[in-house]
């Protein structure tokens, strides 16, 4: 399965929406900066079969959706932008799910690397714990927004390789 061109466009739109969501100058939140340990190796795509890469991307986007659809998130971000953000994430999840359904028929393909799924989950656990520790402060959300933007940019490289991969 090849991810459609619209998938890459949706990813770019997601990044643009996240950029627009910023309400506070990042410079005023420097003291709140945190290294969440983005699992770059899970998004390099070299050791992956395509089906496994798709399931890792799906997990990342699904966790992002859940992170930004909490009550605390709704109280922080502009509602119109959040709705647009959800729409783009759903589009990407649908694209990936369509691909996953096709991969089911491919024999001898491990459909998921469970350790990679767990690694992505742990990355989002670190983000969630940071937010709860900081009591969901505006600066904490700003730090998380910047982190998710960064993670989407890094994962976009894998998505692009998947789109072109035969």
């Amino acid at each position: 399965c090849d991810l459609p061109q619209t998938h890459s466009l949706s990813n770019r739109r997601t990044l643009m929406i996240m950029a627009q969501m910023g309400r506070i100058s990042p410079f005023s939140c420097l003291k709140d900066r945190h290294d969440f340990g983005f699992p770059q190796e899970e998004f390099d795509g070299n050791q992956f079969q395509k089906a496994q890469a798709i399931s890792v991307l799906h997990e990342m986007i699904q966790q992002t959706f859940n992170l930004f659809s909490t009550k605390d998130s709704s109280a922080t971000w502009d509602e119109t932008l959040l709705d647009k953000f959800y729409t783009e994430l759903y589009q990407q999840l649908n694209d990936l799910e369509a691909c996953m359904m096709q991969e089911v028929g491919v024999e001898d393909t491990p459909l998921m690397n469970v350790d990679s799924i767990l690694t992505v989950r742990k990355y989002f656990q670190r983000i969630t714990l940071y937010l709860t520790e900081k009591k969901y402060s505006p600066c904490a959300w700003e730090v998380v927004r910047a982190e998710i933007m960064r993670s989407f940019s890094l994962s976009a490289n894998l998505q692009e390789r998947l789109r072109r991969k035969e």
Epitope: Q62, L118, Q125, T128
Partner: antibody
């Protein structure tokens, strides 16, 4: 509010199969992995496995791979677990629990289904 | 798999007494993924403490959790009747996820 509804009890014969259900409400079903946990009378908890309702992929505890099969029906927002070749060892309460992160990990459980295997 | 051993299996405490339940892991568990659940007879488990030391919503402040690596504990600063229950530790640091065998806490 988040709710997971499970039937109270199932009585089954040795060697037979049973399909347990877990109906979700109060949240977007496809957004969270659903887990299944076994508890034998007066004993600890055992994690059986999990399923992502969004795409149906599963992760199993090796100890249950030949015993349990996890599925979902998105249209009825219900998760299922089929247990096969039942023996007295399978007599237990089976819970479904919703995944999540931080304070939401296993924060929501079904009431459990008591499976009794008896001739 | 990571085996979680809880001790004691059963214990009794008087009202007002300080209680400590322990959970020992067969190999190291990251504290972010160590949880505790409370269960009363005939009910499903309830999330009690998440990520080693954070109290779940509605859990009384007399409860606390601590630990790292292979050694974790749940402490009740002053036992109350409503705390009588079984407590299970749980890890999701690695597959397969595991639970301890539980400590049944009774009131004297």
């Amino acid at each position: 509010q988040v709710q997971l509804q499970q039937p109270g009890a199932e009585l089954v014969k040795p060697g037979a199969s049973v399909k347990l259900s877990c109906k979700a409400s109060g949240y977007t079903f496809t957004n969270y992995w659903m887990h299944w946990v076994k508890q034998r009378p007066g004993q600890g908890l055992e994690w059986i496995g999990e399923i992502n309702p969004s795409h149906g992929r599963t992760i199993y505890n090796e100890n249950f791979k030949s015993k349990a099969t996890l599925t979902v029906d998105k249209s009825s927002i219900t998760a299922f677990m089929q247990l096969s070749s039942l023996t007295s060892e399978d007599s237990a309460v089976y819970f479904c629990a919703r995944g999540g992160l931080g304070p939401a990990w296993f924060a929501y459980w079904g009431q459990g289904t008591l499976v009794t295997v008896s001739a | 798999q990571i085996v979680l051993t809880q001790s004691p299996a059963i214990m009794s405490a008087s009202p007002g007494e300080k209680v400590t339940l322990t959970c020992s892991a067969g190999s190291s568990v990251d504290s972010s993924y160590l949880y505790w659940y409370q269960q009363k007879p005939g009910s499903s488990p309830k999330l009690w403490i998440y990520s080693t030391s954070n109290l779940a919503s509605g859990v009384p402040a007399r409860f606390s959790g601590s630990g790292s690596g292979t050694s974790y504990s749940l402490t009740i600063s002053s036992m109350e009747a409503e705390d009588a229950a079984s407590y299970f530790c749980h890890q999701w640091s690695s597959y397969p996820f595991t639970f301890g065998s539980g400590t049944k806490l009774e009131i004297k």
